[in-house]
Interface confidence: low
């Protein structure tokens, strides 16, 4: 999906209002120094591409992210503010709908969510720079 035509301001507002809080809640109990923040993105569409990939792409190492509250809100936000996004995601997320809710937050997921926080922060920064 090409994120070029998204309403970045609206996405930023949704992130600051809800998604960021859910991400921080997920990470509660860990220090910001526990994981190196290595992921990066160069512009807003690129940031959203990487955010989508780390949030929704399946990995055996961290299987449950797509079912977390922040992931559901991310999906809703992208569907709302990126034209045609929901149509492209229907097939890709069908298996996720069937997946069982995981109650255990493993360290291996924490690494991934830590990177997600970094990507979102970079998304906000690139937004500020463009204004």
């Amino acid at each position: 999906y090409d994120f070029t035509n998204c309403d970045f301001q609206k996405i930023e507002a949704d992130y600051l209002r809800t998604i960021s809080k859910d991400l921080i809640t997920y990470m509660s109990g860990t220090k910001s120094t526990d994981f190196n923040n290595t992921v990066s993105c160069s512009n807003r569409p690129h940031c959203l591409t990487e955010i989508q990939s780390l949030t929704f792409n399946p990995t055996p190492r961290c299987a449950s992210l797509a079912k977390e509250m922040f992931a559901r809100k991310t999906k809703a936000t992208l569907a709302l503010w990126c034209p045609g996004y929901s149509e492209t995601q229907i097939n890709a997320t069908q298996a996720m709908k069937k997946a069982r809710k995981s109650k255990v937050t493993t360290n291996k997921c924490l690494e991934q969510v830590s990177q997600l926080l970094g990507l979102w922060r970079r998304f906000i920064r690139t937004l500020l720079k463009k204004q």
Epitope: F35, N37, E50, T59, C62, A63, S102, S114, Q115
Partner: antibody
Framework: EVQLVESGGGLVQPGGSLRLSCAAS????????MTWVRQAPGKGLEWVSS????????YYADSVKGRFTISRDNAKNSLSLQMNSLRAEDTAVYYC??????????????WGQGVLVTVSS | DIVMTQTPLSLSVTPGEPASISCRSS???????????LHWYLQKPGQSPQLLIY???HRASGVPDRFSGSGSDTDFTLKISRVEAEDVGVYYC?????????FGGGTKVEIK
């Protein structure tokens, strides 16, 4: 263009050491897990080692555990494989690959051209 | 360790005809997230391997639609609907459900 270029191969005596490097370009290296795969002459593919994007998790095949060390420098877009106590059975073409994690479900979607390591006296 | 077994060992196909390669795993590759971690690669003569199919049935970028993957649990199949000369090489399946990640022994496809 997305590219992985390996270097550092060559002939080494049993018990010796070698350091393989992989230079990545054309993609955001720090966002991807990386994996080394090897192929002995005339044989199939064998997974060697994987490292997650932030180096938090590292995995090795039993055949190389304790002898090989995978590492990455995200600032330099580079992946390394330090190989110590080399044995004849380590002789192979070593491929640097992108994947083993969140992208494409853990499959290896980009491969380098490979570098030959020969362990012989 | 999960053992991956490919059949046949080699395959000689007439151009334009279909071809089918089987891959069997020693245990289920279905994860609790409902995804199945089975991938297919092609190594053309003198080249590095390339990703063909990931997660059983998803074609990788740039892969022609004559390639398709199917299967579930422990039994998987790669099909080429009409073999072309450029399809020669060794095909490998791989599981990434758990480490050590393991490959099948390979299936060599030749043109008659």
């Amino acid at each position: 263009e997305v590219q992985l270029v390996e270097s550092g191969g060559g002939l080494v005596q049993p018990g010796g050491s070698l350091r393989l490097s992989c230079a990545a370009s054309g993609f955001t290296f720090s966002n991807y897990d990386m994996t080394w795969v090897r192929q002995a002459p005339g044989k199939g593919l064998e997974w060697v080692s994987s490292i997650t994007f932030a180096s938090s998790y590292i995995y090795y095949a039993d055949s190389v555990k304790g002898r090989f060390t995978i590492s990455r420098d995200n600032a330099k877009n580079s992946l390394s494989l330090q190989m110590n106590s080399l044995r004849a059975e380590d002789t192979a073409v070593y491929y640097c690959t992108r994947g083993g994690g969140a992208y494409y479900g853990g499959s290896l979607d980009v491969w380098g051209q490979g570098v030959l390591v020969t362990v012989s006296s | 360790d999960i053992v991956m077994t490919q059949t046949p060992l080699s395959l000689s196909v007439t151009p334009g005809e279909p071809a089918s390669i089987s891959c069997r795993s020693s245990q289920s590759l279905l994860h609790s997230n409902e995804y199945t971690y089975l991938h297919w690669y092609l190594q053309k003569p003198g080249q590095s391997p390339q990703l063909l199919i990931y997660l059983v049935s998803h074609r990788a970028s740039g892969v022609p639609d004559r390639f398709s993957g199917s299967g579930s649990d422990t039994d998987f199949t790669l099909k080429i609907s009409r073999v072309e000369a450029e399809d020669v090489g060794v095909y490998y399946c791989e599981q990434t459900l758990q480490t050590p990640f393991t490959f099948g022994g390979g299936t060599k496809v030749e043109i008659k």
